[in-house]
């Protein structure tokens, strides 16, 4: 297993950075388990690797503050979370504590997302050693690569368009720094 | 789906012991903390107890502590609660409940309950 | 223990006419990390508990957008936009920001 050792640009925020709350991507790493994967979001909560672009990784990841962001499987509705150990699973709920991640941005393009909570990295579950500690090992880096582009305007019609949604549910201006960590019985 | 059912419960004298049971299926049980709530019938909710996902922190409420243990065999997705030194106030429908993340204090599915009766 | 205080104690409802019931936490429920921990369930007569809202105003999976949580710091509100025949029960609000969680009495929602 190769350790890359790359150096996080600080306060990397992607609301900035690309200009929106919500992205749809794939999150895609070279490095986690020596083979090429998606990252995804099953069904029954589980999270894995796919060797190609799946329905099911297909993620949505919406800004929650600067640097900070939540995943949301696409298909299955789960957010991505992350147990005190470092270990993935995928919640119909969401809780800050285990479901925000920090999105650290590497100057070749490739993401590092860690826990905020914990400051755990992010890991796709490694196939080589089940019982490993996800915890020990360094960050995997992942690649963004853009998801399904949004449906096509519909033709002009009879009925006049709407106007623009400009509304929005992101809680980014509820949300202020997180100094502390979030309430829960300490493990 | 997540699905959650208790057993272990009945009529008991004061002072007894019972120890309740409760089986998930429908999601990763190891992945989340479990609590127990209970109700006197027509009365309103009561928090009783919770374990963390790897039944490293537990809490309890002033009202059972030193009386009710709460455990969990993350093998067999099986939650207990063991209560001794029963009184008539604990006289209640013991609900279990999935926990919203693996530490978090928010209960999101809750079982059917089982029935405690402590009477003389 | 954090004290929850809901009004009003009974709620007679018109189908189709909005509803909303209030919250009060004996002390802020606002964290550090900018989210309420204010929770609301719906207890459907003779069913165990169903999680509505939580965080103080995000739904719960599967439940209809009629329903709606607001609120920050001590004072929470759940609005029905529209009520049904099947919203019927006792709705309760819990705290989840410390130990012990604490649940406010219940309000009884009928139909008129």
């Known amino acids: 297993h190769h350790h890359h050792h790359h150096h996080p640009i600080p306060d990397s925020s992607p609301l900035l950075q690309f200009g929106g709350q919500v992205r749809q991507r794939y999150l895609y790493t070279d490095d986690a388990q020596q083979t090429e994967a998606h990252l995804e979001i099953r069904e029954d909560g589980t999270v894995g690797g796919a060797a190609h672009e799946s329905p099911e990784s297909l993620l949505e990841l919406k800004a929650l503050k600067p640097g900070v962001i939540e995943i949301l499987g696409v298909k299955t509705s789960r957010f991505l979370c992350q147990k005190p150990d470092g270990a993935l699973y995928g919640s119909l709920h969401f809780d800050p504590e285990a479901c925000s991640f920090r999105e650290l941005l590497l100057e070749n393009g490739y993401n590092v997302y860690e826990s905020e909570a914990h400051g755990l990295p992010l890991h796709l579950p490694g196939n080589k050693s089940p019982h490993r500690d996800p915890a020990s090992e360094g960050p995997a880096r992942f690649l963004p690569l853009p998801g399904l582009p949004p449906a096509p305007p519909e033709p002009p019609g009879i009925l006049a368009p709407e106007p623009p949604d400009v509304g929005s549910s992101d809680p980014l201006s509820m949300v202020g720094p997180s100094e502390a960590r979030s309430p829960s019985y300490a493990s | 789906e997540v699905h959650l059912v208790e057993s272990g419960g009945g009529l008991v004298q004061p002072g007894r012991s019972l120890r309740l049971s409760c089986v998930a299926s429908?999601?990763?049980?190891?992945?989340?903390?479990m609590h127990w709530v209970r109700q006197v019938p027509g009365k309103g909710l009561e928090w009783v107890s919770v374990i963390t996902w790897n039944s490293g922190s537990i809490g309890y409420a002033d009202s059972v502590k030193g009386r009710f243990t709460i455990s969990r065999d993350n093998a067999k997705n099986s939650l207990f609660l063991q209560v001794s030194s029963l009184r008539a106030e604990d006289t209640a429908l013991y609900y279990c409940a999935k926990g919203i993340s693996p530490t978090g204090t928010t209960p999101d599915y809750w079982g059917q309950g089982t029935l405690v009766t402590v009477s003389s | 223990d954090i004290v929850m205080t809901q009004s009003p104690l009974s709620l007679p409802v018109t189908p189709g006419e909005p509803a909303s019931i209030s919250c009060r936490s004996s002390?802020?429920?606002?964290?550090?990390?900018?989210?309420?921990?204010l929770d609301w369930y719906l207890q459907k007569p003779g069913q165990s508990p169903q999680l509505l809202i939580y965080?103080?105003?995000t739904r719960a999976s599967g439940v209809p957008d009629r329903f709606s949580g607001s609120g920050s710091g001590t004072d929470f509100t759940l609005k029905i936009s529209r009520v049904e025949a099947e919203d019927v029960g006792v709705y309760y609000c819990?705290?989840?920001?410390?130990?012990?969680?604490?649940f406010g009495g219940g309000t009884k929602v009928e139909i008129k």
């Open positions: 429908g999601f990763t049980f190891d992945d989340y903390a």
């Open positions: 002390q802020s429920l606002l964290h550090s990390n900018g989210y309420n921990y």
């Open positions: 819990m705290q989840a920001l410390q130990t012990p969680p604490t």
């Open positions: 965080l103080g105003s």
